[in-house]
């Protein structure tokens, strides 16, 4: 175009519907210039105007010829331009912030603006740039892009931004601009101008303030603190660590803490100091709640559900910042909250949830929440399978009869729909405990009853009980123990009875043993002894317990003696024994030796013995009648071990084995023996009966049984040259080769001649007896042989 004609045609649009085209006037033209603008499109349009710009409707795609005629005083000039959409710039109108507000407690800015979308013909993407500036010096803090879409109508947009620095610390400015990224527009797209700036500031009073106050943050976070002050701030500390000051407007300062450490329960102090004062705030650095661990729900009573859990990792936040828990049941929509006062027991927390009528399956979600976050755990539970009964209370025992009792107890809860498995522990004194399991139908009223049989009469039992449901989840704790004595019953057996004739053979002495408690079935009060023959029955007067012996004058006819034990309920069956022994001519006395504590006796099976066998024993040295104790063993036995606290080693006892038929006893074997053999306590007394020049005859006596302390097995006779009261060695001193020893194993031998001796020589003689228990002490003598004649 010529310089004297209109030139530099440019077109812009702010809404894609109208193009605003402007040009530069020809040089030298004044105010009174008119323009004729013609646009060559389908219909030739011309416009008359007095200014250097024109708004025209947006042209469709393609090239258009624009003719601008300038008409002025000194003539006219014409310029032709080719106009295409690609030559047009899209520059949106300057946006305006409708509202800027702040939430100081969260340091968040809230921005509101209108996109004026109604002026645009079709949908377009819009990019917004939001600029945050801080301090009076308007330092750029943040430049963010935010995408929206134009949808043909005016839309309000909201945007928020959380500041890393508390908003109270400094003035914050915000401005926005936009860029319309229209797919339908092929021209140049440009950013709008920045909006007028808006700001937010905190109105301080005259007091110095530190921000934020009581903030809860995640361990490891970064945080900024500031002090709004009229005085010069000299230092800042977090805990004991000095922090570099960041200067804000006026005397205001800030500090930035990176990667903050976990706080103590009282929080972490942040302190600013001035010349004269100190100002503080507390920060609580902790963790969000961990997922509740080991969530478990059970019921004690089918009325209330108890859910327990472990909080997991500690949050380091306490008091009002501690984790709060809510237990939600999704089928019913009901929930309960954990009250902080219900402090955790041994590291686990618990909550009670009221059971709902006719609901057995519960879907629990436990929500944990603290200022830093939330977490949850879920559990699906059929509560009838998770019954942990209370400890049974009011546990009582009542008699039914002597072998049965009734147990009653209280188990709180409504268990009408389930069965219990209860375990009863039965303990008899000094015996192992027995456990019996019983199944009981659950009831609504909490009272339970069970009968227990197969007990022993007159026995002290200790009972206790625990219960679980039949489907078994947990045993209840054991109830208190209840001690109970069952009632008496008649004695189940007659006393174990024996008899001996007195030493003069005129009286029969009857002995019996007290009945064991499990046969006495009560306290034995007395005994009845009676004596019967074919002609008559004679009853002795009642013998009170604890007397266990009676004496009757009897002739040598055969009598049957009966002994009956009586308690408060009644009498035992009679124990019967014949007064006379069945003779046995073929009897030898045998030797037996025990095993330290007792003695094993064996015998051959004898089918004639129909009632039992009796082993009787006594101390050999005691006078008649020989009875220390007796033991009955069944008729099918062929051996027994006799043990008694009265047995002593080295004491000789007589043992008698009797067999019984028709209440009559026959002596089958007679034995003497020791529980344990010991060495003799004395040496045999010996004398020299005769001496010659080359021999000596020695004679000795028996050792009494009491001193023998075992079965005599032989003698040891030592002899050798030796003189009394000299330094020459004694016979028994070791290492002497001239000592001679004779072992005499024939215990009936009582003399010994020693030959081949030297005449007129002194000999030392020593005699010792031995048993299987050892060698006894020595007896010694010095003898001088005669001179050779």
């Amino acid at each position: 175009q010529k310089k004297g004609a209109p030139h530099d045609l440019k077109c812009v649009t702010n809404n894609l519907q109208v193009w605003d085209c402007y040009w530069k006037a020809p040089s030298g033209t004044g105010r009174g210039t008119d323009y004729e603008v013609c646009i060559e499109n389908r219909s030739h349009s011309c416009y008359q105007l007095e200014k250097t710009n024109i708004k025209i409707p947006a042209l469709s795609h393609g090239d258009y010829e624009i003719t601008i005629n300038s008409l002025h005083d000194f003539g006219s000039s014409t310029s032709k331009f080719t106009l295409n959409e690609q030559n047009v710039s899209l520059i949106p109108d300057t946006p305006e912030i409708l509202n800027l507000s702040a939430d100081f407690s969260t340091s968040t800015l809230y921005l509101k603006w209108n996109d004026r979308g109604s002026v645009f013909p079709h949908h377009s993407n819009v990019i917004w740039e939001i600029k945050i500036l801080r301090k009076e010096s308007m330092e750029l803090v943040k430049l963010v892009t935010h995408n929206t879409t134009l949808n043909g109508k005016d839309t309000l947009h909201h945007w928020s931004w959380a500041s890393d620095m508390p908003l109270e610390c400094a003035i914050h400015f915000v401005e926005i601009r936009c860029y319309i990224d229209s797919l339908h527009f092929s021209g140049r797209k440009e950013w709008s101008d920045w909006s007028p700036v808006k700001n937010i500031s905190w109105m301080p009073d005259s007091q110095t303030k530190v921000f934020p106050q009581d903030k809860v943050i995640l361990v490891g976070s970064d945080i900024t603190f500031c002090c709004i002050s009229q005085e010069k701030v000299l230092s800042a500390l977090i805990g004991h660590t000095n922090c570099p000051l960041i200067h804000l407007d006026g005397e205001n300062v800030a500090i930035k803490i990176h990667n903050i450490s976990v706080s103590a329960s009282s929080g972490t102090n942040v302190v600013f100091t001035t010349e004269d004062n100190i100002f503080g705030t507390v920060i609580f650095a902790g963790y969000p709640p961990d997922t509740p661990q080991q969530l478990n729900c059970e019921t004690h009573d089918l009325k209330e559900i108890l859910c327990r859990w472990n909080p997991g990792r500690a949050t380091a936040l306490v008091g009002p910042r501690a984790t709060s828990y809510t237990l939600l049941e999704s089928f019913s929509g009901k929930y309960v909250r954990f009250k902080r006062a219900e402090a955790p027991t041994n590291g686990s927390y618990q909550l009670f949830f009221q059971m709902l009528p006719n609901q057995e399956i519960y879907n629990f979600t436990l929500n944990a929440h603290n200022p830093l976050g939330r977490s949850e755990s879920t559990i699906l539970v059929n509560i009838t399978e998770k019954v942990y009964p209370h400890t049974p209370t009011s546990f009582k025992v009542k008699d039914i009869n002597s072998t049965a009792v009734k147990l009653s107890w209280h188990l709180p809860g409504n268990f009408a729909k389930i069965n219990f498995l209860c375990q009863i522990e039965i303990k008899k004194s000094n015996t192992v405990q027995e456990q019996r399991n019983v199944t009981i139908k659950g009831v609504e009223n909490s009272s339970y009853l069970v009968a227990l049989d197969k007990l022993n009469p007159y026995t002290v039992y200790t009972f206790r009980i625990r219960c679980s449901t039949e489907t078994f989840w947990k045993w209840s704790k054991w109830s208190n123990k209840k001690q109970h004595l069952t009632t008496e019953a008649i004695p189940s057996k007659g006393p174990d009875t024996w008899r001996e004739w007195s030493s003069d053979g005129k009286n029969l002495i009857i002995y019996w043993k007290p009945l064991p408690i499990n046969e006495a079935n009560g306290k034995i009060l007395s005994y009845n002894v009676s004596c019967s023959s074919d002609e008559e029955t004679q009853s002795l007067s009642e013998i009170p317990d604890p007397q266990h012996k009676a004496e009757i004058q009897l002739d040598k006819n055969d009598y049957i003696i009966s002994v009956v034990a009586k308690n408060s309920v009644g009498s035992s069956p009679p124990s019967k024994i014949a007064s006379m022994e069945i003779p046995n001519d073929d009897l030898k006395i045998e030797q037996v030796v025990g095993m330290g504590k007792g003695i094993l006796l064996t015998w051959h099976y004898d089918p004639n013995m129909t009632c039992d066998y009796v082993i009787k024993w006594c101390n050999s040295s005691r006078s008649e009648p020989c009875l220390m104790d007796w033991r009955k063993v069944p008729s099918n036995s062929t051996e027994t071990v006799i043990e008694s606290d009265q047995f002593r080693p080295g004491v000789r006892y007589n043992f008698f084995l009797y067999g019984c038929r028709n209440q009559g006893y026959q002596l089958l074997r007679s034995m003497i023996g020791y529980i344990e053999e010991l060495a003799p306590t004395v040496a045999p007394n010996f004398t020299v009966e005769d001496t010659s020049a080359d021999s000596i005859l020695v004679k000795w006596e028996d050792i009494p049984v009491e001193e023998l302390r075992g079965f005599l097995r032989g003698y040891l006779f030592y002899f050798g040259k030796g003189e009394r009261d000299t330094s020459k060695m004694r016979v028994l001193e070791s290492g002497r080769s001239d000592i001679k020893v004779k072992n005499i194993t024939d215990i009936s031998q009582k003399t010994l001649r020693i030959a081949d001796l030297q005449g007129k020589t002194s000999y030392h003689l020593v005699l010792r007896a031995y048993t299987d228990g050892g060698v006894g002490p020595e007896k010694s003598m010095y003898v001088v042989t005669k001179e050779n004649s």
């Epitope: 009282s266 004062n277 503080g280 705030t281 507390v282 009002p320």
Partner: antibody, heavy 122, light 108 residues
Framework: QVQLVESGGGVVQPGRSLRLSCAAS????????MDWVRQAPGKGLEWVAV????????FYADSVRGRFTISRDNSQNTLYLQMNSLRAEDTAVYYC???????????????WGQGTLVTVSS | EIVLTQSPGTLSLSPGGRATLSCRAS???????LAWYQQKPGQAPRLLIY???SRATGIPDRFSGSGSGTDFTLTISRLEPEDFAVYYC?????????FGPGIKVDIK
């Protein structure tokens, strides 16, 4: 057990000086901030001064700033309050108090002495 | 400075009764920096509550504290004979550390 024993109180004329001491025992004195608090007869409590556990900082109530000096001797487990230019309105029972938090700043006062009476009178 | 006001000035109650003592600050106080003390005649004060709600060592659980910002409360749930005394609130978050004027709890 923690014990704080104040001494040095008495009757003094206006304009004169007095030095109060507080002997501490039963705790690690050098790890706790210490304060002086006073109570005029029949009146409420008034905070007077604080000194940090290490003695690095001291702060005062406006009513005593420039006249009173708080100090401590950690080797002797003793806290001091040097009171100059005393006035009638300084008449009070003076308590020394230990701050609750071990090695912390800005704490409540968990242990107090039995107090010593300062009477400023002509 | 932060001014603390306490109300009521005197509280007359019977043993077993519930006492609610109020403390108001002239400007916001961090709850972490508010304490309550009890003082009996002729004795030094005794720390009851710190951090607005935490009980000091050995303080019975009938004493509880609550509140935030400018309004704080000390509650004694069941007054025992030994609880009749003067109660002070204190802020220790910025110097000068200030006490309230005190509330006297006496026997009705």
């Amino acid at each position: 057990q923690v014990q704080l024993v104040e001494s040095g109180g008495g009757v003094v004329q206006p304009g004169r000086s007095l030095r109060l001491s507080c002997a501490a025992s039963g705790f690690t004195f050098s790890s706790y901030g210490m304060d002086w608090v006073r109570q005029a007869p029949g009146k409420g409590l008034e905070w007077v001064a604080v000194i940090w556990y290490d003695g690095s900082n001291k702060f005062y109530a406006d009513s005593v700033r420039g006249r009173f000096t708080i100090s401590r001797d950690n080797s002797q487990n003793t806290l001091y309050l040097q009171m100059n230019s005393l006035r009638a309105e300084d008449t009070a029972v003076y308590y020394c108090a230990r701050e609750l938090w071990f090695g912390e700043l800005l704490s409540p006062f968990d242990f107090w002495g039995q107090g010593t009476l300062v009477t400023v009178s002509s | 400075e932060i001014v603390l006001t306490q109300s009521p000035g005197t509280l007359s109650l019977s043993p077993g009764g519930r006492a609610t003592l109020s403390c108001r600050a002239s400007q916001s106080v961090s709850s972490s920096y508010l304490a309550w003390y009890q003082q009996k005649p002729g004795q030094a004060p005794r720390l009851l509550i710190y951090g607005a709600s935490s009980r000091a060592t050995g303080i019975p659980d009938r004493f509880s504290g609550s509140g935030s910002g400018t309004d704080f409360t000390l509650t004694i749930s069941r007054l025992e004979p030994e609880d009749f005394a003067v109660y002070y609130c204190q802020q220790y978050g910025s110097s000068p550390f200030t006490f309230g004027p005190g509330i006297k709890v006496d026997i009705k």
